[in-house]
C-alpha cells in the first residue's frame, strides 16, 4: 500500500503506518503494525527520556561524581535528567557541568563586583581611585579610603589601589 | 460548550476562489488538530485535510493537494479552507471539524472527529 | 489510500429491530475507526470511537466491535429516531477514508 500522506503530531511513519510515539518516560518495545498498537514501557530506576520518542533505550541519568566537585542540584525523573552543580567554593567548568574548577580569587587591587555561583567564576574589576584592596579573595569588594578629615586628621601617605591612605594628626602651629 | 461555528453560504462562478471560515470556541483552539471535509449534494463524506493549528502542519488528500490551502489565525481561533479553480461538481456542503484524542498505555491515540460544524453550502454555477 | 467498504448501502427495517453494518478495510487499522450518524440536513454525529468505545450522551443500543480489518456498528433496537445513514471513518493516517455510507429505512 502507498504510505499515509503524513503523521499527525506525537506519530511517525514506520513500514506505512502512522505508529504513536511513546509518551517521555516511556520507551518502544515493539512497532506498531496493521492489526496491534505501539507498544511502550516505563523506563527504569535512574533511567529517563524527555522527548515522545521511538528509542528502543531509555537514557542513564548523569552521575554528579563528587571526585569531580559535583553534586546532585536536582534528582533526575523518568521524563527528566539529573541536574549537577558543584560544591561549595567550586563552579561548573561548562554549561553541561561535568567538572568543577575552584572559584578565582581577586588579587590585590582588585575587588569582587560579582560573586561567583555554582556555574560562573568570580568577575574581579580593578579597584578605581578612591578605592583599594589589600588581600586575595573570592568575596572582598574593593573597599573605599579612609576619610581623614571626618576623623579631623590629615593624609599622612596616599593610598593606592592596593593600600588604604594613613592619616595623621594635623600640625599644630606653634605660637 | 465546545463550538465550531462556519461563515456562512457562497455563490461563486467556475474558475473563482472561495474561503470558508470555522471560529472554535469551549475549548483550547491549539491542542485539537482541525479536519475539513465535504459532501456533494445526494452523495457521501469526503475527506479534504487537515491542519494543525498549533504547528500550521497540513496534510490534504491527493485529489485537493493542488487546489485547498487549509490555514489558522490562533490570535482569533478561527481555522480557513480554501478552495480555488472551483468547478460544478465543487458544489457541496463543507464541514471543519474537531478531532480529538487522548493518551493511554504510553502513548497518544487518535480519536477521529468529535465536534463539527454547522457546515457552509458552496453552490458554483455560471 | 485506505479504502472502506462499507455494507449494505442502503436497508429497510422496523422499530425494534436489530440492525447490523460492516466496514471492511482495504489494510489493517487497528483500532482507528469511527462510526458516524447523519441525518438529513445536519452536520454527521460521532457514536463510537476507537472501533468500540462509545461516546458519552449515545444510547446503550449503539454498539462497536472488531474483528481483524472488519468492522461493525450493531443497533440493539432500532428507535424512530435512528432512521439516518450511517458512515464509517478510518483515521489510521492520512488521507482519512470514509466508507460509502448505510441508509437506515423505515420498512
Known amino acids: 500500500p502507498e504510505p499515509p500522506t503524513a503523521c499527525r503530531e506525537k506519530q511517525y511513519l514506520i513500514n506505512s503506518q502512522c505508529c504513536s510515539l511513546c509518551q517521555p518516560g516511556q520507551k518502544l518495545v515493539s512497532d506498531c503494525t496493521e492489526f496491534t498498537e505501539t507498544e511502550c514501557l516505563p523506563c527504569g530506576e535512574s533511567e529517563f527520556l524527555d522527548t515522545w520518542n521511538r528509542e528502543t533505550h531509555c537514557h542513564q541519568h548523569k552521575y554528579c561524581d563528587p571526585n569531580l566537585g559535583l553534586r546532585v542540584q536536582q534528582k533526575g525523573t523518568s521524563e527528566t535528567d539529573t541536574i549537577c552543580t558543584c560544591e561549595e567554593g567550586w563552579h561548573c567548568t561548562s554549561e553541561a557541568c561535568e567538572s568543577c574548577v575552584l572559584h578565582r580569587s581577586c588579587s590585590p587591587g582588585f575587588g569582587v563586583k560579582q560573586i561567583a555561583t555554582g556555574v560562573s567564576d568570580t568577575i574581579c574589576e580593578p579597584c578605581p581611585v578612591g578605592f583599594f584592596s589589600n588581600v586575595s579573595s573570592a568575596f572582598e569588594k574593593c573597599h573605599p579610603w579612609t576619610s581623614c578629615e571626618t576623623k579631623d586628621l590629615v593624609v599622612q601617605q596616599a593610598g593606592t589601589n592596593k593600600t588604604d591612605v594613613v592619616c595623621g594628626p594635623q600640625d599644630r602651629l606653634r605660637a | 460548550q465546545v463550538q465550531l461555528v462556519q461563515s456562512g453560504a457562497e455563490v461563486k462562478k467556475p474558475g473563482a476562489s472561495v474561503k470558508v471560515s470555522c471560529k472554535a470556541s469551549g475549548y483550547t483552539f491549539t491542542d485539537y488538530y482541525i479536519h475539513w471535509v465535504r459532501q456533494a449534494p445526494g452523495q457521501g463524506l469526503e475527506w479534504m485535510g487537515w491542519?494543525?493549528?498549533?504547528?500550521?502542519?497540513?496534510s490534504y488528500a491527493q485529489k485537493f493537494q493542488d487546489r485547498v490551502t487549509v490555514t489558522r489565525d490562533t490570535s482569533i481561533n478561527t481555522a480557513y479552507m480554501e478552495l480555488s479553480r472551483l468547478k460544478s461538481d465543487d458544489t457541496a456542503v463543507y464541514y471543519c471539524?474537531?478531532?480529538?484524542?487522548?493518551?493511554?498505555?504510553?502513548?497518544?491515540?487518535?480519536?477521529?472527529?468529535?465536534?463539527w460544524g454547522q457546515g457552509t453550502t458552496v453552490t458554483v454555477s455560471s | 489510500d485506505i479504502q472502506m467498504t462499507q455494507s449494505p448501502s442502503s436497508l429497510s427495517a422496523s422499530v425494534g429491530d436489530r440492525v447490523t453494518i460492516t466496514c471492511r478495510a482495504s489494510?489493517?487499522?487497528?483500532?482507528?475507526l469511527g462510526w458516524y450518524q447523519q441525518k438529513p440536513g445536519k452536520a454527521p454525529k460521532r457514536l463510537i470511537y476507537?472501533?468500540?468505545s462509545l461516546d458519552s450522551g449515545v444510547p446503550s443500543r449503539f454498539s462497536g466491535s472488531r474483528s481483524g480489518s472488519e468492522f461493525t456498528l450493531t443497533i440493539s433496537s432500532l428507535q424512530p429516531e435512528d432512521f439516518a445513514t450511517y458512515y464509517c471513518l478510518q483515521y489510521s493516517g492520512s488521507p482519512l477514508t470514509f466508507g460509502g455510507g448505510t441508509k437506515v429505512e423505515i420498512k
Open positions: 471539524a474537531r478531532e480529538v484524542g487522548g493518551y493511554g498505555s504510553g502513548t497518544y491515540r487518535y480519536y477521529g472527529m468529535d465536534v
Open positions: 491542519i494543525n493549528p498549533n504547528s500550521g502542519d497540513t
Open positions: 476507537a472501533a468500540s
Open positions: 489494510q489493517g487499522i487497528r483500532n482507528e
